[in-house]
């Protein structure tokens, strides 16, 4: 009876289990009753990082110097190239596809430490009583306005992104 499932590192094709190609190799032809799976190593500047049945290897990532990128770790037949940014610049994401001078802290966050040549901006959440309504690479969280010192009352509570709104006190007639 033909199998309905195969072991790890195998795949089901034409009612039989074939071996997957190992990392660094691509599939040339499926196995048959009489032959093993045929695999070929990935070419220069190509890779496959899993046991697979891919017929094409993936191209290594290109670290574009025009975007401020350089190679941090050269790719192999089993791993992709890892890019990083030029000194003083910072990756915009985990994948490091572009570089920024420094990242900003979003509304609700303030700058704890301004970026330096070696470290990016460090942000911190605005605690209760403080807010930030801007994206900035230098502005700290600002304290809520004190309505009391202006002889006013809080009409709308503040949040981590908005200041309190003050208004006149209700006068007793």
């Amino acid at each position: 009876e033909p199998p309905t499932a195969c072991r790890e590192k195998q795949y089901l094709i034409n009612s039989q289990c074939c071996s997957l190609c190992q990392p660094g190799q691509k599939l040339v032809s499926d196995c048959t009753e009489f032959t093993e799976t045929e695999c070929l190593p990935c070419g220069e500047s190509e890779f496959l990082d899993t046991w697979n049945r891919e017929t094409h290897c993936h191209q290594h990532k290109y670290c574009d110097p025009n975007l401020g990128l350089r190679v941090q770790q050269k790719g192999t037949s089993e791993t992709d190239t890892i890019c990083t940014c030029e000194e003083g610049w910072h990756c915009t994401s985990e994948a490091c596809e572009s570089c920024v001078l420094h990242r900003s802290c979003s509304p609700g966050f303030g700058v704890k430490q301004i970026a330096t040549g070696v470290s990016d901006t460090i942000c911190e959440p605005c605690p209760v009583g403080f807010f930030s309504n801007v994206s900035s690479a230098f502005e700290k969280c600002h304290p809520w306005t004190s309505c009391e010192t202006k002889d006013l009352v809080v009409q709308q509570a503040g949040t981590n992104k908005t200041d309190v709104v003050c208004g006149p006190q209700d006068r007793l007639r």
């Epitope: 025009n66 975007l67 401020g68 940014c85 030029e86 610049w89 915009t92 572009s98 570089c99 920024v100 001078l101 420094h102 990242r103 900003s104 801007v134 994206s135 900035s136 690479a137 230098f138 502005e139």
Partner: nanobody
Framework: EVQLLESGGGLVQPGGSLRLSCAAS???????EMWWVRQAPGKGLERVS?????????YYADSVKGRFTISRDNSKNTLYLQMNSLRAEDTAVYHC?????????WGQGTLVTVSN
Amino acid sequence: EVQLLESGGGLVQPGGSLRLSCAASGFTFRDYEMWWVRQAPGKGLERVSAINPQGTRTYYADSVKGRFTISRDNSKNTLYLQMNSLRAEDTAVYHCAKLPMFFEDWGQGTLVTVSN
């Protein structure tokens, strides 16, 4: 396309003054926080000063506090850096930058040399 064109650099004696300008185009200048960043020969990038979009809040590195003043004219899409009491250690290429500042938008900068 973002363009930032710095000007106003030159050779100045210690104790002298210079005013740098940065003409911005390709983006809505009034919406962006702007920075002055410098790079001394053989050194890393140093963030010198910053200003919020409205021009109401500023930041200065300790090394320039009390000597440099950042300002902006949103009607002219221009950023300024007034530099007084210049020292030899202020010698650097000065760049203006927007937030966020992508590498590909980085300009040539303007060279400030403080020397006798």
